[in-house]
């Protein structure tokens, strides 16, 4: 499980690998703060509601964010 309440940052392990945008329930981008010095990206999957931490520095994850924002802009009027 990549999440923990016992450390200041939410993510313990992060993945460089993208996921299929269509399988995402939610994508949270948590900015760096006094509690955690790095940006964290948490993907909640539609299947089983599983949460995954994604590496914001990974090119593949940046591509995923681009794809998701493009999808959102298509949907919004």
């Amino acid at each position: 499980v990549p999440l923990s309440r016992t450390v200041r940052c939410t993510c313990i392990s992060i993945s460089n690998q993208p996921v299929n945008p269509r399988s995402l329930e939610k994508l949270e981008i948590i900015p760096a703060s006094q509690f955690c010095p790095r940006v964290e990206i948490i993907a909640t999957m539609k299947k089983k509601g599983e949460k995954r931490c994604l590496n914001p520095e990974s090119k593949a994850i940046k591509n995923l964010l681009k794809a998701v924002s493009k999808e959102r802009s298509k949907r919004s009027p």
Partner: antibody
Framework: EVQLVQSGAEVKKPGATVKISCKVS????????MHWVRQAPGKGLKWMGW????????TYADDFKGRFTFTLDTSTSTAYMELSSLRSEDTAVYYC????????????WGQGTTVTVSS | DIQMTQSPSSLSASVGDRVTITCKAD??????IAWYQQKPGKAPKLLLH???TLQPGIPSRFSGSGSGRDYTFTISSLQPEDIATYYC?????????FGQGTKLEIK
Amino acid sequence: EVQLVQSGAEVKKPGATVKISCKVSGYTFTDYSMHWVRQAPGKGLKWMGWINTETGEPTYADDFKGRFTFTLDTSTSTAYMELSSLRSEDTAVYYCARNYDYDGYFDVWGQGTTVTVSS
Amino acid sequence: DIQMTQSPSSLSASVGDRVTITCKADQDINKYIAWYQQKPGKAPKLLLHHTSTLQPGIPSRFSGSGSGRDYTFTISSLQPEDIATYYCLQYDSLLFTFGQGTKLEIK
């Protein structure tokens, strides 16, 4: 040494199913996504999609939705590509390619598997 | 999907010639282009990524440049072993696309 070793050439009849394997060595299998690329005889390279090796979740390019299935066996560090209801136009060389996700490009390729569909 | 238009589709040159291949994307790909060499019966081999970064072990006669939508791959002095087909790949999107390829022959 990082290696992707694919299964041997296949000759199949139209309507049959083929399953190609891509066994990796020299790195941790679940650290990199695995992509598949098709090359028809005398033609260029066409990206087919990828599988997330941590979750097993496949993603298919639009032209490769329906008859194509990407799967994994993480215990043997092997990726598979299965193609059903074979047609003559599926005759091609199929490559697996590791994506160096952090930077985003394909850095290591399998040697290719030739699939020939002929009645 | 991002479309990549590669030209020329074939090219004949002499040993020692400077050879240039171009790829044009239909939108800005932010320098996220790689170049591959494929010899007959072999898998593609990565030469350059991020427009101009040479892979370890690749001779310095291979180079790349460009930005925005327009990219160039150059062999400064063609060698007999460079006879192959060359492909560009854009990876600025989750949906990858290759150029159509350029077949390079010796005159």
